[in-house]
C-alpha cells in the first residue's frame, strides 16, 4: 500500500491559520483564506503548508522503511497499517537527522520560518498524550531545546 | 483501496447551475484536503479548487471565481461543487482529487463527470 | 501561475526501446530548505483519470514499476521509460505544486 493509504492524520498540518504566530491582521487573512477572495492567498496558503508537510512525510516515510530491506533513493514509499506514532524510531533515521541539519546550519531563519508551528502542531496531536511525551523524547534526544527558542525568536523577528 | 465516485454531470444551457458531487471512501475523508480538477480537449489539465480538510479554506482558480463554490460534508464523505453562471468554455470531465500529505499533490481521482454546456 | 511546457507533444518509440519525456516551469520549483523539487509526473490511459507516477521530481509512488524514473532540478525536469512496455501507451503530464497547481499540456506516448 501507498503512503496515502494510512491514516495518519494529516490534517494536524493542514491547520486553517497558516501562520499562528502572527499578529491580529493575520485574522482578516484567516477569513479571506477560508472565502477563497484573494488569487495570491492559496499561494501563500502553499507556502504555510510547504515545511510542515516535509516533516510529515519524513515521519511517515521513516516509519514506512521498517517494512522494507533498505532504504531506496528518495526515501521510496512503503507504507503499512496506520499511524503509529512511533517518533522516536522515526529520528533514529537518517532523513531526519539531515533534516534537522539542514536547519541547524542556518536555513531556517529565512526558509522556515513555519517550524515553531510545526512544533506546536506536532505537540497538539494525539489526544492519548502518549505523543506529546514522545515530544519531549525528541527535543532531548537532539538537544534541540535551544534551537526551538531560537526558532521562536526568529519567527518574531524575521517574519515572512 | 481508495474510491472517489463524481457524479451530477450532465448537459445545461449556458447561465445555467449545476452541482456536482464526489462520494470518498477507503481513507479518513475528514483528514485530508480536496481538489477540483477538470480536463479538456483544448485546455488540458486545469485545476479548479481546493478546500482544507475541515472546510476553513477554500480556494479558486480565476476562471471560476465568484462563479463556482466548493464545499464538503465530512460526516457524509462527500465533496461538492456547485457551479453557476455556466459559460461554454466550462465544458469539460470534472474530477475530484484526493491530495496526498503534500499539498496540491494528487494521489487519487475520481473517474469523472461531464459537464457540458450548451445551448 | 507558473507555466509548464512539455516535449515532445506527442511520442513514438518501439517497444523495449527508452522513452524520454521533457518539462520545462517557468520558475524554479526547487524549494531549497529541503532541497526537494515540488514536480509530479502522472500517467492517463485512455477513458481513465490521471495517475500519479513520480513527485518531488524523482521519487516513484508505490506500486509504479522500476522502468519509470525521474530527473532534472530547478526548471528542467525530465521523465524516462528506460525499455517500453504495451501498457505504457498513455498520455503523460507533468506538473508543479510549488505553487496554485498547474500542469503542461500533456505528451502523447506511442508504439512505433
Known amino acids: 500500500r501507498s503512503l496515502q493509504d494510512t491514516e495518519e492524520k494529516s490534517r494536524s498540518f493542514s491547520a486553517s491559520q497558516a501562520d499562528p504566530l502572527s499578529d491580529p491582521d493575520q485574522m482578516n487573512e484567516d477569513k479571506r483564506h477560508s472565502q477563497g477572495t484573494f488569487t495570491s492567498d492559496y499561494s501563500k496558503y502553499l507556502d504555510s503548508r510547504r515545511a510542515q508537510d516535509f516533516v510529515q512525510w519524513l515521519m511517515n516515510t521513516k516509519r514506512n522503511r521498517n517494512n522494507i530491506a533498505k532504504r531506496h533513493d528518495e526515501f521510496e514509499r512503503h507504507a503499512e497499517g496506520t499511524f503509529t506514532s512511533d517518533v522516536s524510531s522515526y529520528l533514529e533515521g537518517q532523513a531526519a537527522k539531515e533534516f534537522i541539519a539542514w536547519l541547524v546550519k542556518g536555513r531556517g531563519r529565512r526558509d522556515f520560518p513555519e517550524e515553531v508551528a510545526i512544533v506546536e502542531e506536532l505537540g497538539r496531536r494525539h489526544a492519548d498524550g502518549s505523543f506529546s511525551d514522545e515530544m519531549n523524547t525528541i527535543l532531548d534526544n537532539l538537544a534541540a531545546r535551544d534551537f526551538i527558542n531560537w526558532l521562536i525568536q526568529t519567527k518574531i523577528t524575521d517574519r515572512k | 483501496q481508495v474510491q472517489l465516485v463524481e457524479s451530477g454531470g450532465g448537459v445545461v444551457q449556458p447561465g445555467r447551475s449545476l452541482r456536482l458531487s464526489c462520494a470518498a471512501s477507503?481513507?479518513?475523508?475528514?483528514?485530508?484536503?480536496m481538489h477540483w480538477v477538470r480536463q479538456t480537449p483544448g485546455k488540458g489539465l486545469e485545476w479548479v479548487a481546493f478546500?482544507?480538510?475541515?472546510?476553513?479554506?477554500?480556494y479558486y482558480a480565476d476562471s471560476v471565481k465568484g462563479r463556482f463554490t466548493i464545499s464538503r460534508d465530512n460526516s457524509k464523505n462527500t465533496l461538492f461543487l456547485q457551479m453557476n453562471s455556466l459559460r461554454a468554455e466550462d465544458t469539460a470531465v470534472y474530477y475530484c482529487?484526493?491530495?496526498?500529505?503534500?499539498?496540491?499533490?494528487?494521489?487519487?481521482w475520481g473517474q469523472g463527470t461531464l459537464v457540458t454546456v450548451s445551448s | 501561475d507558473i507555466v509548464m511546457t512539455q516535449s515532445p507533444d506527442s511520442l513514438a518509440v518501439s517497444l523495449g526501446e527508452r522513452a524520454t519525456i521533457n518539462c520545462k516551469s517557468s520558475?524554479?520549483?526547487?524549494?531549497?530548505?529541503?532541497?526537494?523539487?515540488?514536480l509530479a509526473w502522472y500517467q492517463q490511459k485512455p477513458g481513465q483519470p490521471p495517475k500519479l507516477l513520480i513527485y518531488?521530481?524523482?521519487t516513484r509512488e508505490s506500486g509504479v514499476p522500476d522502468r519509470f524514473s525521474g530527473s532534472g532540478s530547478g526548471t528542467d525536469f525530465t521523465l524516462t521509460i528506460s525499455s517500453l512496455q504495451a501498457e505504457d501507451v498513455a498520455l503523460y503530464y507533468c506538473?508543479?505544486?510549488?505553487?496554485?497547481?498547474?500542469f503542461g499540456q500533456g505528451t502523447k506516448l506511442e508504439i512505433k
Open positions: 518531488w521530481a524523482s
Open positions: 477507503g481513507f479518513t475523508f475528514s483528514s485530508y484536503g
Open positions: 506538473q508543479q505544486y510549488y505553487n496554485t497547481p498547474t
Open positions: 478546500i482544507s480538510y475541515d472546510g476553513n479554506n477554500k
Open positions: 482529487a484526493k491530495e496526498s500529505i503534500l499539498a496540491a499533490l494528487f494521489d487519487y
Open positions: 520558475q524554479s520549483v526547487l524549494y531549497s530548505s529541503n532541497n526537494k523539487n515540488y
